[in-house]
Amino acid sequence: HTAAQDNCTCPTNKMTVCSPDGPGGRCQCRALGSGMAVDCSTLTSKCLLLKARMSAPKNARTLVRPSEHALVDNDGLYDPDCDPEGRFKARQCNQTSVCWCVNSVGVRRTDKGDLSLRCDELVRTHHILIDLRHRPTAGAFNHSDLDAELRRLFRERYRLHPKFVAAVHYEQPTIQIELRQNTSQKAAGDVDIGDAAYYFERDIKGESLFQGRGGLDLRVRGEPLQVERTLIYYLDEIPPKFSMKRLTHHHHHHHHHH
């Protein structure tokens, strides 16, 4: 549980409280909501971040709920149960004993049930497609420059190993970033693609999770890249289990931002 020693803060997570009472007298930063100590040298897990967001003062901006027909990541609108390592527990339940199964990014992947619902394992989201539309610019961005800049961003800001950024596609004004990370590929210490995608999502929305850093200032060859719409698709290693009625309408988990 490392942190900046000088003034005991958490560079990678502003939703923490830090004090010099960790093991060995080191600085220890606890995530709001859960109280779990976090490793401030890397990204905090999405589950702990959502839990922290739910515990924060309720005067934060109100989000528009996505369409009832989409399987969505509710973007902090539910208070998740996290395991001792800070990952999502496979089964999530609300206060009225309605339960559902989630994947590794916390997105519901089954119909809702009662307390008898079983979720045998946490199914890994191994492929994330981030679909962006940028604001109009004088001309299209150079694809290779855009590709290089986005890969640099994920490598340097989110510390995601370059091999997990599978591709960057561009057809003006749509940019698609593909993140891929199978269970077998993820080594100890590797940033999870779900966590990187969540930090990116919050950055794009102007809600950076980093302590004291300015907001995300994306530029391609000096030209600002301003995103006006984000759509995130999550694909799991095991397909989601919905009733047939639902499956006829939906092919992806997705998370829509305006």
């Epitope: 005991c8 409280v17 004090s19 010099p20 009472d21 093991p23 859960s34 109280g35 779990m36 001792p84």
Partner: antibody, heavy 115, light 107 residues
């Protein structure tokens, strides 16, 4: 040296409120959590909650969330806990303690709730 | 919440003997366990932090071990002043909880 000094014993009637103080000295008050723990007669230790004086971020044990209020006055390095709607089973010694591993404890404040 | 179970509830030993107190957590808490001694009419006193870290001023006969879910406090050779109640406490996540205590009494 680090010291936590608590206010004196209190006797209250059921339904009343009590406020216990914990004055810290010998360290930087704002940088360490202050926890509140209670111990009923002949019983074990029970965590009530904690407050981080720097920003007054407080966390409560679910059991006490509706009745306990923790505050901190940085200007006088003092933490407080107020417990409302007292019941006879709130009779206990109330302790404040510092840091996540409770390295320093107050001397305890006996709160007796009796009609 | 994380439940801490201490055993035995009571331990009867003689001065000079070795005492082994156990604390089991209901889930993995790494090394976020701390041990306290409490004597009648006194505030608890920290003996060991983070499972095995020694505390200044605490005699070296007190030691701690364990990680994950199983933890042990060992008193290598009991002194008369060691007979008291011992508690474990976790700081892994909120709410913090204590074990129910082990009473160490003179045999």
């Amino acid at each position: 040296q680090v010291q936590l000094v608590q206010s004196g014993a209190e006797v209250k009637k059921p339904g009343a409120s009590v406020k216990v103080s914990c004055k810290a000295s010998g360290y930087t008050f704002t940088t360490h959590w202050i926890h509140w723990v209670r111990q009923a007669p002949g019983q074990g230790l029970e965590w009530i909650g904690t407050i981080f004086p720097s920003n007054a971020y407080a966390v409560y044990n679910q059991k006490f969330r509706d009745r306990a209020t923790m505050t901190a006055d940085r200007s006088i390095s003092t933490a407080y806990i107020e417990l409302s709607r007292l019941r006879s089973d709130d009779t206990a010694v109330y302790y404040c303690a510092r840091a996540s591993y409770f390295d320093y404890w107050g001397q305890g404040t006996t709160v007796t709730v009796s009609s | 919440e994380i439940v801490l179970t201490q055993s035995p509830a009571t331990l009867s030993l003689s001065p000079g003997e070795r005492a082994t107190l156990s604390c089991r957590a209901s889930q993995n808490i790494g090394t976020s366990i701390h041990w306290f001694q409490q004597k009648p009419g006194q505030s608890p006193r920290l003996l060991i932090k983070y499972a095995s870290e020694s505390i200044s001023g605490i005699p070296s006969r007190f030691s701690g071990s364990g990680s994950g879910t199983d933890f042990t406090l060992t008193i290598s050779s009991l002194e008369p002043e060691d007979f008291a109640v011992y508690y474990c406490q976790h700081s892994h996540s909120w709410p913090f909880t204590f074990g129910q205590g082990t009473k160490l009494e003179i045999k």
